[in-house]
């Protein structure tokens, strides 16, 4: 099994590891499947690409019957199988079988924290946000290891790229010192950013 690892939105080339001459194509059926679902077929020269892969998949017949998936999505991750059937005697027989495992990485960048003064009050508001990751993120605010209540946390997903964006607001009393951590967990991974508030200097120091 061949392993291919790519970043989301990148291009992945999955090779069948087999060549068929142009003359042989008329007597050949090629199936690319992903976890038992069809991706692409070429039957006696006629090519068909399944709807989920249309307009973003190229079949490179001259390069080991590779499929090239453009603008990778998280859902493209999985095991692909290429089957080459060759006509001999009175039936198509399996001439070649190959498996390629595709991993699609979609890491959230370190979140950014911005702060705003709320006029005529001792309350200051900070907003933590990041985008472009997968799977669905879970954001929490921590101070001294204790979880805090955010004002509102929004998680959205781009239907086209399947990537998530997350944003959360937290209000705090600016008359005392604070060290807040914005922690984002997604799958088995996590990213975080710390916001420090110092009352003496009336300024903040984000950790970079």
């Amino acid at each position: 099994v061949i392993h291919v690892t790519k970043e989301v939105k990148e291009v992945a080339t999955l090779s069948c590891g087999h060549n068929v001459s142009v003359e042989e194509l008329a007597q050949t059926r090629i199936y690319w499947q992903k976890e038992k679902k069809m991706v692409l077929t070429m039957m006696s020269g006629d090519m068909n690409i399944w709807p989920e892969y249309k307009n973003r998949t190229i079949f490179d017949i001259t390069n080991n019957l590779s499929i090239v998936i453009l603008a990778l999505r998280p859902s493209d991750e999985g095991t692909y199988e290429c089957v080459v059937l060759k006509y001999e005697k009175d039936a198509f027989k399996r001439e070649h079988l190959a498996e390629v495992t595709l991993s699609v990485k979609a890491d959230f960048p370190t979140p950014s924290i911005s702060d705003f003064e709320i006029p005529t009050s001792n309350i200051r508001r900070i907003i933590c946000s990041t985008s472009g990751g997968f799977p669905e993120p879970h954001l929490s605010w921590l101070e001294n290891g204790e979880e805090l209540n955010a004002i509102n946390t929004t998680v959205s997903q781009d239907p086209e790229t399947e990537l998530y964006a997350v944003s959360s607001k937290l209000d705090f009393n600016m008359t005392t010192n604070h060290s807040f951590m914005c922690l984002i967990k997604y799958g088995h991974l996590r990213v975080n950013q710390t916001f420090n508030w110092n009352t003496t200097k009336q300024e903040h120091f984000p950790d970079n």
Epitope: A26, T41, S44, D46, N48, E81, A91, R94
Partner: antibody
Framework: EVQLVQSGAEVKKPGASVKVSCKPS????????MHWVRQAPGQGLEWIGW????????LYDPKFQGKATITADTSTSTAYMELSSLRSEDTAVYYC?????????WGQGTLVTVSS | DIQMTQSPSSLSASVGDRVTITCSVS???????LHWYQQKPGKAPKPLIY???NLASGVPSRFSGSGSGTDYTLTISSLQPEDVATYYC?????????FGQGTKVEIK
């Protein structure tokens, strides 16, 4: 000589399931994709799907996804098609056929009648 | 899905007549992926012509096929009583595989 022998006619009640078998002779199903085709009374031919018996991969016409389940047992060299949640409109003759440039070899057909 | 439209849906001709059945395909396919079958009542379909124009094993030479792209034809040069059957075209260009609705041929 290549032959495909199917199981006998079945009469089932609505909501029931039925499993039709297709036993080839003259070849081993492990080496060939096996297809199923349906023909309702007085109607045309409709392709249901195929199985690659070597690895169990299947492909269905979306119309039959969830209705038909195609399986194969390479130890007995037999292909099967199970139909679930039967309704009167599933009454038809079901054929198995072997993959080729075209369908050169067909089973004799199995009539499945759904009636209360 | 690729749609296959046969015409006529039925015909009646005399013994010795030349009979033509057409099959129109909704999108262009390779001629090697167009096949014809003959089905007699109560029997399984039998291959007649494969790859547009090649006669299947044991098929009499009065049957012939032609066409390309989206238009295909099955011809019986001299109709015989044993040709009474329903004829189907079928594409193997893309999944799901599809058949024409059938043309029933009868003797006058």
């Amino acid at each position: 000589e290549v032959q495909l022998v199917q199981s006998g006619a079945e009469v089932k009640k609505p909501g029931a399931s039925v499993k039709v078998s297709c036993k080839p002779s003259g070849f081993n199903i492990k080496d060939y994709y096996m297809h199923w085709v349906r023909q309702a009374p007085g109607q045309g031919l409709e392709w249901i799907g195929w199985i690659d018996p070597e690895n169990g991969n299947t492909l269905y016409d979306p119309k039959f996804q969830g209705k038909a389940t195609i399986t194969a047992d390479t130890s007995t060299s037999t292909a099967y098609m199970e139909l679930s949640s039967l309704r009167s409109e599933d009454t038809a003759v079901y054929y198995c056929a072997r993959e080729g440039l075209f369908f050169a070899y067909w089973g004799q057909g199995t009539l499945v009648t759904v009636s209360s | 899905d690729i749609q296959m439209t046969q015409s006529p849906s039925s015909l009646s001709a005399s013994v010795g007549d030349r009979v033509t059945i057409t099959c129109s395909v909704s999108s262009s396919i390779s001629s090697s992926n167009l096949h014809w079958y003959q089905q007699k009542p109560g029997k399984a379909p039998k291959p007649l012509i494969y790859g547009t124009s090649n006669l299947a094993s044991g098929v009499p030479s009065r049957f012939s096929g032609s066409g390309s792209g989206t238009d295909y034809t099955l011809t019986i040069s001299s109709l015989q009583p044993e040709d009474v059957a329903t004829y189907y075209c079928q594409q193997w260009s893309s999944y799901p595989l599809t058949f024409g609705q059938g043309t029933k041929v009868e003797i006058k």
